[in-house]
Structure formats: C-alpha cells, structure tokens
C-alpha cells in the first residue's frame, strides 16, 4: 500500500540549524537520508577547535561521516545512527550544541498518528531507562473491535539508548506468533498489530532495558468480535523460494477466517502465449482446493521432484462470503550448477543491489 511520506520526517540532505546552547534539538530523519547537524559559534564569535560526540564517544571521520568544526554530516543514515549527538569545545569539553537524532523508516509507515514523541529525549547523562510519556501509558486495558489496528507504545529513554522487546502473556512475542504478523517500530517504541482477531486477546508487556536497568509495562487487549470478516493471511507467508532441480519444496499459508473459507493453491499459467485472458484476468490453474471448517488453518503445498516447469508465480487464496485474501509468491528452479553460480555472483556483487 502507498502510505506517503509524513511531513515531520526531515527531507533528504536537509540542513538543520543548531539550537541555543543548553537546549536539546530533537530531530527525525528518514533511513537513507543525509543527516546534517549545524552548530554555529555561540554569539557569532570564534568557534575554536571542536569535537563531535555520539552517545559519549568521539566520532571518527570516514567516507560516510564527514566532520567539520561547525557541521556534521552522516550520509546514507540508518537506525544505528540514532542517538545523542553533541558538538563540544575540544579543550573544555563544554557542550555547544546537542541533538537527539532518530532515524526512522522512510517513508513513514503511517501507523504513528500522534508523532510528537517520535524523537524522545535520549538523555546526555548516563542512566537507566525511564518512561518519557508516562501520562500516555495510563490506559492499561484496550478493548477494540476485531479487524481494527492496535498500537501499544512504551516511549522511553536512557543512556545508552535502551532496547525494547515485547512479551505476550509473559512469553517472547514475535511476528510469526500471529496471523497478520506484527510491526515493531523501535524508533516509536511501539508494537503494531493490524486486523486483530480474538486469538490476539491477552497481556502484552514491553520490556525496556539497557546495562543500567530494566523497566516494563503491561497492557491488556480484549478483541470484540467483528464477525463475519473476510479471511486474513499470516504476514510473510507463503515466502518466495529457490529450489534445485529435482528437489522437494513446501510452501505454507496460514489462514484465519470465522466463516468457512474456500482455500486454493493456484499457479499462474500461459494460454496460447498469453498470461491474461481477454478481460485482463490472469490465467491460473487450481493445484489444490478445499473448504476449511476450522477458524485457523495452516495449509501446505508440497511440490516433489521439481522441474523448471514448476518455476513461476503461485497464489494462496482464501475466499469466504465476505471477501478474499490472497498472497502471491514465487518459486525459482535452478540446476545444481546454476545454483552454485548464483551464489558466486551474489558474492561478487558485494554491496551492489537492485531496488
């Protein structure tokens, strides 16, 4: 889906004027942006020698990190470049400017509606984690209709910047644990679950920790059934696969539907050299088709002794009387030699990639 870039994400190679001394500037950049921090001399007087520091450690200039007396540039920024930056007088170590920089996915995912605390105070002083917006964490019980999007937030800070992890009912919680997957927005200290279903009910705990301590907060989610609803497929399944000629492959598709879904495995085919019919509908052949009586179905497609003919685009499709959910995926089939060559080519390619 196209979500668009949110205005608060600072544009590529945008220069940001420095704050008044003693103030902390909170800045958000998009992944891949050029971070430019500017620290003019206080009162316009002479600057003297300066050093740029990130999270208490002096920055070493490199091809990507360009250090000047009044300006710092970090090219092709990534999440690792988030942190507390300061420009200091070399001799006195007096802080002339300091910035809290957070590098987020860009364009923004669109699920961070409020956004004001996207760049939290990471704190210049060393210290254990603490909540930066405790007033936003008062609502411990969340009851939402099924099919809605739920977002739990635990905005925190500390130095070094703490890590955040999530538990469901006291156990580690990962994307593969739920139909529809999850989105972890570490920069927003949030857990996002789209299209929630009754099985998402439970206690969700955020654990925020660094080497100086750990804090946690538990939310309870109740899902009010919005039924019937169209089928939901688990995010990331089925996954694309590459197989060697003659091998066996297996694809998984997890379907959630409270109304008996018709589940199909389909393969795109060509008819008379065309992939689509006169009306523009793709030609497909049905490989497997059945009706599931269970609310959650973990369905598999197994292809034995694959040949080059098996390569191509496939679909897992679930249909009930409300609507359809489908996921396309690819199978690439190579001879053993071709597979080896592909590994060599990938190795030689180094950092070159296709978008």
């Amino acid at each position: 889906e196209s979500l668009g870039t949110e205005q608060r994400v600072v544009g590529r190679a945008a220069e940001v004027p420095g704050p008044e001394p003693g103030q902390q500037e909170q800045l958000v950049f998009g992944s891949g942006d050029a971070v430019e921090l500017s620290c003019p001399p206080p009162g316009g007087g002479p600057m003297g020698p300066t050093v740029w520091v990130k999270d208490g450690t002096g920055l070493v200039p490199s091809e990507r990190v360009l250090v000047g007396p009044q300006r710092l540039q970090v090219l092709n920024a990534s999440h690792e470049d988030s942190g507390a930056y300061s420009c200091r007088q070399r001799l006195t170590q007096r802080v002339l400017c300091h910035f809290s920089v957070r590098v987020t996915d860009a364009p923004s995912s669109g699920d961070d509606e409020d956004g004001e605390d996207e760049a939290e105070d990471t704190g210049v002083d060393t210290g254990a984690p603490y909540w930066t917006r405790p007033e936003r964490m008062d609502k411990k019980l969340l009851a939402v209709p099924a099919a809605n999007t739920v977002r739990f937030r635990c905005p925190a800070a500390g130095n070094p910047t703490p890590s955040i992890s999530w538990l469901k009912n006291g156990r580690e919680f990962r994307g593969e644990h739920r139909i529809g997957g999850i989105k972890l927005r570490h920069q927003q200290w949030s857990l996002v679950m789209e299209s929630v279903v009754p099985s998402d009910r439970g206690n969700y705990t955020c654990v925020v920790e660094n080497k100086f301590g750990s804090i946690r907060q538990t939310y309870t989610l109740d899902v009010l059934e919005r039924s019937p609803h169209r089928p939901i497929l688990q995010a990331g399944l089925p996954a694309n696969q590459t197989a060697v000629l003659g091998s066996d492959v297996e694809f998984h598709c997890k379907v959630y539907s409270d109304a008996q879904p018709h589940i199909q495995w389909l393969k795109h085919v060509e008819v008379n050299g065309s992939k689509v019919g006169p009306d523009g509908t793709p030609y497909v052949t049905v490989l497997k088709s059945w009706i599931s009586e269970s609310v959650e179905a973990d369905v598999r497609l197994r292809l034995a002794n694959v040949s080059e003919r098996d390569g191509g685009e496939y679909l897992c499709r679930a249909t009930n009387f409300i609507g359809v959910a489908e996921k396309a995926f690819w199978l690439s089939v190579h001879g053993p030699r071709a597979a080896e060559e592909e590994l060599v080519e990938a190795d030689e390619a180094g950092s070159v990639y296709a978008g």
Epitope: P228, R230, A259, Q260, D279, T281, E293, F321, I322, G323
Partner: antibody, heavy 115, light 108 residues
Amino acid sequence: QVQLQESGPGLVKPSETLSLTCTVSGDSINSYFWSWIRQLPGKELEWIGHIYSSGSTRYNPSLQSRVTISIDTSKNQFSLKLSSVTAADTAVYYCARGASAVDYWGQGTLVTVSS
Amino acid sequence: EIVLTQSPGTLSLSPGERATLSCRTSQSISSGYLAWYQQKPGQAPRLLIYGASRRATGIPDRFSGSGSGTDFTLTISRLEPEDFVVYYCQQYGSSPYTFGQGTKLEIK
C-alpha cells in the same frame, strides 16, 4: 462502520432499464464481495447477483439475461442494471456487502415499474 | 435451485418464552452454509447467524443457530419485546442463493 447507500430513480417504465448505484463509505470496496438483493411486494427476498472488487460477477440464473452488475473502485461504488423491466420487477432493492450471505445492507430503495 | 421452507409461518408467543423457528432445505447444504436474518418493519434485514451456528457481531447470546444437512433451527432463548418481528433463513452453499419465505413472530 461500513455504510451503503442506494441511489437511482424510483419509477421506471416497462421495457426500460432500471439503474441503481450503491455508494460504500467507511471502508474500501477492495477485496470484498458486493451484492444486490430485492424484496418483492409479498416480502419474498430474492438474490440478484454479486460482484467482486476485481469485477468478476455471478448472477441469479433467473435474471441473468437481463442483469449487469459493475463496479468502480475509484469511486467506491457498484451498480445494478436490469433491462426490459416489467411490473413483476417492482420491489425494494438493497445493496449489501457479501457474496451470498450479507452482513451490511443499505436501507433499500423502492423501485416501481409503471407506465 | 434449493428451496427453503420455514415453519411455522407465524409463531405466537409471550415475552420471556423460548422460540424455536425451523428452516428445511430441499437439498443438503454443504458446510452449514446457512444464515438467519431478522427484519423489522421498514428496515433492511439484519444478519443474526451465519455458518448455521455462528453469531454475527452485536447479536445477543439469546439467539442461537443449530442444524446441518437439510434441517436447521433458530432458537431465541428468552423473548424480548423487540424480537417480535420477521425472520428469514438463507442458504448460500449453492447458486442461486435462496431465502425462505419467512416466519413472523408475534406477541400472544
């Protein structure tokens, strides 16, 4: 909350074509089935047909030769055309979400076939 | 096409009583593809039950559906004054999807 609203003329002359449009609000029309159902004066409910957001359709065989259902995803609308109408087509016409069983209905619009 | 026969045509009961509405199909319905709707005067029908026994959102638990094959039942455990309206069953397992003629629930 999904809402559906039928619109179109309430009076159609015999042998002409009945045309109704349903506007969907509160959700995208994509990935769902959308149906037309009518309720005849004797209160009998009759399924007319449905359309999927891709444009694929299924019609009641008893009406198939006269029915066309189309969809405009950019406007979040779908439409019904019923040709060569007679007095027997006088009914309250409902648009609804779902292919067969339906969970959301419009409030219905009465279409009278009369000269 | 599959014909649905609802019985009785009219059912007279008092508030607080239990109502049992029947729907019989001319052919077996695959996978319990049967729905029940409630229709109040001047309103569109409202989905109560789908899949023969699954309650739709917001439907009070006094409504329950059961049955399989050709015999299906809608049960209202304790009748409230607002329940005295018309009920339709519908099969959606085989096109054309067809409705019963309705059962009118009236206050005795």
